[in-house]
Interface confidence: low
């Protein structure tokens, strides 16, 4: 960012999307602003219109190509600018030389499904979405389970320190409704952060068999 009151943060999803948020105190109202992406070694450039997400912050997604296309590599640098229109001119409001594989945030895992459920345990699988083949197996996951009467924030985090796209939840209560979420993070990148949480998967454990101890 160009001054202390402005913050310009972007993340690469490892394939063909750069998501950006720009916030600025006292930013001009009713001004058209956009993010412009200018790679150092590619023939393309791309823009997206910044749309308000709060009183003083705007966001947009730079769509670089087909969702699963590998548009950038570990050696690319992309100059990202926030440009705001002032009359007939475009004024540069913020700028960064963006190293995509140092600023990763993957898409949330998808296709969560219950593989097998019992009275006290449940096996759940998922898939990662639009993740670069460069990572090979260098990914980690966090998962959490929402129990009745609790909030997501209270749910303990389960860490999977390898590319393991399933989990076996144990010590569950029979005949109880639960929800499950998972998120993913590459091991690479100084400023890399966790993906958003997946959509919650609701499941119910099987009731205990009549006449049996639980």
């Amino acid at each position: 960012a160009v001054n202390g009151t402005s913050q310009f943060t972007c993340f690469y999803n490892s394939r063909a999307n750069i998501s950006c948020v720009w916030s600025q105190d006292g930013a001009l109202q009713d001004t058209s602003c956009q993010v412009h992406a200018w790679p150092d070694r590619r023939r393309w450039n791309q823009t997206c219109e910044l749309l308000p997400v709060s009183q003083a912050s705007w966001a947009c997604n730079l769509i670089l190509g087909a969702p699963d296309s590998q548009k950038l590599t570990t050696v690319d640098i992309v100059t990202l600018r926030v440009l705001c229109r002032e009359g007939v001119r475009w004024r540069v409001m913020a700028i960064q030389d963006f190293k995509p594989f140092e600023n990763l945030r993957l898409m949330a895992p998808i296709s969560l499904q219950v593989v097998h459920v019992e009275t006290h345990r449940c096996n759940i699988s998922w898939e990662i979405s639009q993740a670069s083949h460069y990572f090979e197996r260098h990914l980690e996951f966090e998962a959490r389970t929402l129990s009745p009467g609790h909030t997501w924030e209270e749910a303990p985090l389960l860490t999977l320190k390898q590319k393991q796209e399933w989990i076996c939840l144990e010590t569950l209560t029979p005949d109880t409704q639960y929800e499950f979420q998972v998120r993913v993070k590459p091991l690479q990148g100084e400023f890399t952060t966790w993906s958003p949480w997946s959509q919650p998967l609701a499941f119910r454990t099987k009731p205990a068999a009549l006449g049996k101890d639980t």
Epitope: W38, T79, R81, R89, W90, V92, I95
Partner: nanobody, 123 residues
Framework: QVQLVESGGGLVQPGGSLRLSCAAS????????MAWFRQAPGKEREFVAS????????DYVDSVKGRFTVSRDNAKNTVYLQMNNLKPEDTAVYYC????????????????WGQGTQVTVSS
């Protein structure tokens, strides 16, 4: 609005070198794409070289390619023009220019200008 002050001009023999500097003040320097122009006696002001706000991308007029190098130091709010293998036809007043619209930096009417510094190449 940014203010620009050039320095480093002078008299130099053909084949010699000079380094021009342009110090900026009054606004956030990194917002500006910077350029050097020159104007020889009786001729129109012409584009010489430009450097984008990040300093990563440069552009030159064909006649100076391989001889001149434009650069900037955003920490010092300064842009430079290193001129090597100078020729008599490089004699001109050299102007520093700034524009927040990097698509318009070659446009004479939309830039902010310094006062210029004289470069004379003569034996």
């Amino acid at each position: 609005q940014v203010q620009l002050v050039e320095s480093g001009g002078g008299l130099v023999q053909p084949g010699g070198s000079l380094r021009l500097s342009c110090a900026a003040s009054g606004d956030v320097f990194v917002r500006y794409t910077m350029a050097w122009f020159r104007q020889a006696p009786g001729k129109e002001r012409e584009f010489v070289a430009s450097v984008t706000d990040s300093g990563r991308t440069t552009d030159y007029v064909d006649s100076v390619k391989g001889r001149f190098t434009v650069s900037r130091d955003n920490a010092k709010n300064t842009v430079y023009l290193q001129m090597n293998n100078l020729k008599p036809e490089d004699t001109a007043v050299y102007y520093c220019a700034a524009n927040t619209d990097y698509f318009q930096i070659k446009s004479l009417d939309r830039n902010t200008w310094g006062q210029g510094t004289q470069v004379t190449v003569s034996s």
